[in-house]
């Protein structure tokens, strides 16, 4: 299982991505919780779904990174990137995003957690 924790301050922009290179794929999908698609890319185009993220997300199909602008506390969730490989099987990566209010203590905690995550990636 691939699971990464991220902590960010509300109002900031965030990039959700994985630390490894993507397998050769024919479809890439980002989910917010297990049943809600945010965006799906196949070899032709990106399709953005009706969701609370519409208009403030962008997918980089090359890296698989998902850019979210102006994150709010309600964006706290586990995000899943699913890749459908050319072989016909899929792989998932999960990012647990915690959005904190921009109080001084929260910012300090966020910096601590981000430092910890940078040095201890969980897979």
């Amino acid at each position: 299982m691939h699971l990464v924790h991220m902590t960010v301050v509300s109002g900031s922009n965030v990039t959700l991505n994985i630390s490894e290179s993507l397998p050769e794929n024919k479809q890439l999908t980002w989910f917010y919780t297990f049943d809600q698609k945010i965006v799906e890319w196949d070899s032709r185009k990106s399709k953005y779904f009706e969701s609370k993220f519409k208009g403030r997300v962008r997918l980089d199909p090359q890296s698989g990174a998902l850019y979210i602008s102006k994150v709010q506390k309600e964006d706290n969730s586990t995000y899943i990137m699913r890749v459908l490989k050319k072989t016909g099987n899929e792989q998932e990566w999960k990012i647990k995003l915690q959005v904190l209010d921009p109080g001084l203590n929260d910012i300090f905690e966020a910096q601590k957690i981000e430092w910890h995550e940078h040095h201890h990636h969980h897979h």
Epitope: M1, Q36, I80, R82, L84, E90
Partner: antibody, heavy 120, light 107 residues
Framework: QVQLVQSGAEVKKPGASVKVSCKAS????????MHWVRQAPGQGLEWMGG????????SYNQKFTGRATLTVDKSTSTAYMELSSLRSEDTAVYYC?????????????WGQGTLVTVSS | DIQMTQSPSSLSASVGDRVTITCKAS??????VAWYQQKPGKVPKLLIY???TRHTGVPSRFSGSGSGTDFTLTISSLQPEDVATYYC?????????FGQGTKLEIK
Amino acid sequence: QVQLVQSGAEVKKPGASVKVSCKASGYTFTEYTMHWVRQAPGQGLEWMGGINPDTGDTSYNQKFTGRATLTVDKSTSTAYMELSSLRSEDTAVYYCARAQFWTTPRFAYWGQGTLVTVSS
Amino acid sequence: DIQMTQSPSSLSASVGDRVTITCKASQDVGTAVAWYQQKPGKVPKLLIYWASTRHTGVPSRFSGSGSGTDFTLTISSLQPEDVATYYCQQYSTYPITFGQGTKLEIK
């Protein structure tokens, strides 16, 4: 190997509730979503809903929203489906089925099924 | 909700025949389609997923094809043990939906 073992058959009166359990083994319970599918006698398959055992997030078929409740007990790797306000049309075999990963609800693993009979 | 319409609803064929079952989605589901086989009194068994990938242990006579809205399950040479009801399922969009089933019998 992956196993999903469901509770036994139930006979209920109209208006009552039923709670069916599904005990999972042979894999990490929190890494795959669990779904419930029912099949009325001689009829096809009908998806009722799914639950993420890790987060408790649920997704329901609108037809069952308000009547079906999906829960899990992580400590025992057990999923539950409770259906309330039963009527005769709810007579069916109820299956739990494990998805492939969190986000791919195709079902290679199924419980043996639980027959729920609703009769006055 | 996405409707999955299977045809035919029942069919009778001889051992060795090539059998084709079709499934039409009411909107584009990409390739997020699975096919199941259910024998009387038994649990459904996954045959095909992502429209064309055979599940582990499924005989090579079973194949799937299609994308978008039109999908096909083919049995290249019908065997007596293939008597069952076959269901398609879309998992592109919630709620998940199944076709109404195709009952396959031997002539």
